[in-house]
Interface confidence: medium
C-alpha cells in the first residue's frame, strides 16, 4: 500500500508515534517519505547482504528475520515480511524499539540526511489529526 501523507500521519498518530521518545509526528512522516516514499512494500538491498523492509525501511541485520541475512539479530522478533503489510502495526512497534535503542531517529539514514534540523511540521500541515 502507498499511503497518502495525511493518511500516514493519522495512522502513525493512532499507533502512538507522536512525540514517542520526544520525536514529533512530523519526524516520523518525513522519515517514511524519504525511506520508502510512503510505500509499505518497499524493499532495498544493502551491500552487506542485508535488506531493508517496509515503510520505515527496517534492516534485517538487526531488527527482523528474513531467513537469509548472516548473523541476523532479529531484535524485534518478527519476520521481515510482516513489515511489508498494509497494516503498519508491526513496522511501528519495531520502530519504537529501534528509536529507544540509544541513537534515537539517527538510526534512519534518510531522517538524518533529509529531515533532521528541517521544518518537519510541514509534513503534517493541513492534516486533520
Amino acid at each position: 500500500k502507498v499511503f497518502g501523507r495525511c493518511e500516514l500521519a493519522a495512522a502513525m498518530k493512532r499507533h502512538g508515534l507522536d512525540n514517542y521518545r520526544g520525536y514529533s509526528l512530523g519526524n516520523w512522516v518525513c522519515a517514511a517519505k524519504f525511506e520508502s516514499n510512503f510505500n509499505t512494500q518497499a524493499t532495498n538491498r544493502n551491500t552487506d547482504g542485508s535488506t531493508d523492509y517496509g515503510i520505515l525501511q527496517i534492516n534485517s541485520r538487526w531488527w527482523c528475520n528474513d531467513g537469509r541475512t548472516p548473523g541476523s539479530r532479529n531484535l524485534c522478533n518478527i519476520p521481515c515480511s510482516a513489515l511489508l503489510s498494509s497494516d503498519i502495526t508491526a513496522s511501528v512497534n519495531c520502530a519504537k524499539k529501534i528509536v529507544s535503542d540509544g541513537n534515537g531517529m539517527n538510526a534512519w539514514v534518510a531522517w538524518r540526511n533529509r529531515c533532521k534540523g528541517t521544518d518537519v511540521q510541514a509534513w503534517i500541515r493541513g492534516c486533520r489529526l
Partner: antibody
C-alpha cells in the same frame, strides 16, 4: 517438511513464452524469498533473480531483465517464472529454491527445450 | 559481479583418498560462501554453509574452511557416493553467483 515442487518438462518453439511453477509446502510461503536458478550443460549455475511472495517484491539479475518475470500466488503457495521470446539459449534446467542466503531447499528442476 | 573460480575443473581420485577443492572469489566475501554437491539428474544439495558450517545430515568427512577470497572444501576419505559435481556460491552481494564447478570422478 519443506518441499518445492516444480512443473513438468516443456518443449517450446522459438519466440514463444513459457510459465514455470514452483509449489511450496511445509513453511510460511510469504515469509521467504524464492530464488530462480538456470543450469545449462557447460555453463554451470546462474542466478536469475528472486521474489518475496508476501509483497511481490522482485529483483532480477541484469542479464535476465526482460527475459524472466516472477509472480507469486500466496493463496496457492505457488511461485511462477515466465520466460519470454524463447531462443535455443533458453534451453536449460530451471530450479526454484528457497532463498536462505544459501539454498538448502531446491525444487526438482524443470527442463525447458526450445526447438523448432 | 563477484566471480567465483573453482579449481581444479576435474579431480580423479580413488575411494579412500582425501581431497581438497578450491573456490576463489574475485573480491572479499567474508564467510558468505556455500558448497553444494550435485549428482547427474538431481538438484544441488547443500553441504557447507557460511564457509565452514556443515549442513545437518551431511557426513563429518566433509569440511569447509576459508574467509575473504580463498575457500576450501575438504573430503576426508572419499566414498563412492561422493562422486559428482561440486559448486561454490556466494551470498555476500547481488547478483548471487556460482563457481563453474569441480567434477570429482573415480580414477
Amino acid at each position: 517438511q519443506v518441499q518445492l515442487q516444480e512443473s513438468g518438462a516443456e518443449v517450446m518453439k522459438p519466440g514463444a513464452s513459457v510459465k514455470i511453477s514452483c509449489k511450496a509446502t511445509g513453511y510460511t510461503f510469504s515469509t521467504y524469498w524464492i530464488e530462480w536458478v538456470k543450469q545449462r550443460p557447460g555453463h554451470g549455475l546462474e542466478w536469475i533473480g528472486e521474489i518475496l511472495p508476501g509483497s511481490g517484491s522482485t529483483y532480477y539479475n541484469e542479464k535476465f531483465k526482460g527475459k524472466a518475470t516472477f509472480t507469486a500466488d500466496t493463496s496457492s503457495n505457488t511461485a511462477y517464472m515466465q520466460l519470454s521470446s524463447l531462443t535455443s539459449e533458453d534451453s536449460a534446467v530451471y530450479y526454484c529454491a528457497r532463498g536462505d542466503g544459501n539454498y538448502c531447499y531446491w525444487g526438482q528442476g524443470t527442463t525447458l527445450t526450445v526447438s523448432s | 559481479d563477484i566471480e567465483l573460480t573453482q579449481s581444479p575443473a576435474t579431480l580423479s581420485v580413488t575411494p579412500g583418498d582425501s581431497v581438497s577443492l578450491s573456490c576463489r572469489a574475485s573480491q572479499s566475501i567474508s564467510n558468505n560462501l556455500h558448497w553444494y554437491q550435485q549428482k547427474p539428474h538431481e538438484s544441488p544439495r547443500l553441504l557447507i554453509k557460511y564457509a565452514s558450517q556443515r549442513q545437518s545430515g551431511i557426513p563429518s568427512r566433509f569440511s569447509g574452511s576459508g574467509s575473504g577470497t580463498d575457500f576450501t572444501l575438504s573430503i576426508n576419505s572419499v566414498e563412492t557416493e561422493d562422486f559428482g559435481m561440486y559448486f561454490c556460491q556466494q551470498s555476500n552481494s547481488w547478483p548471487r553467483t556460482f563457481g563453474g564447478g569441480t567434477k570429482l570422478e573415480i580414477k
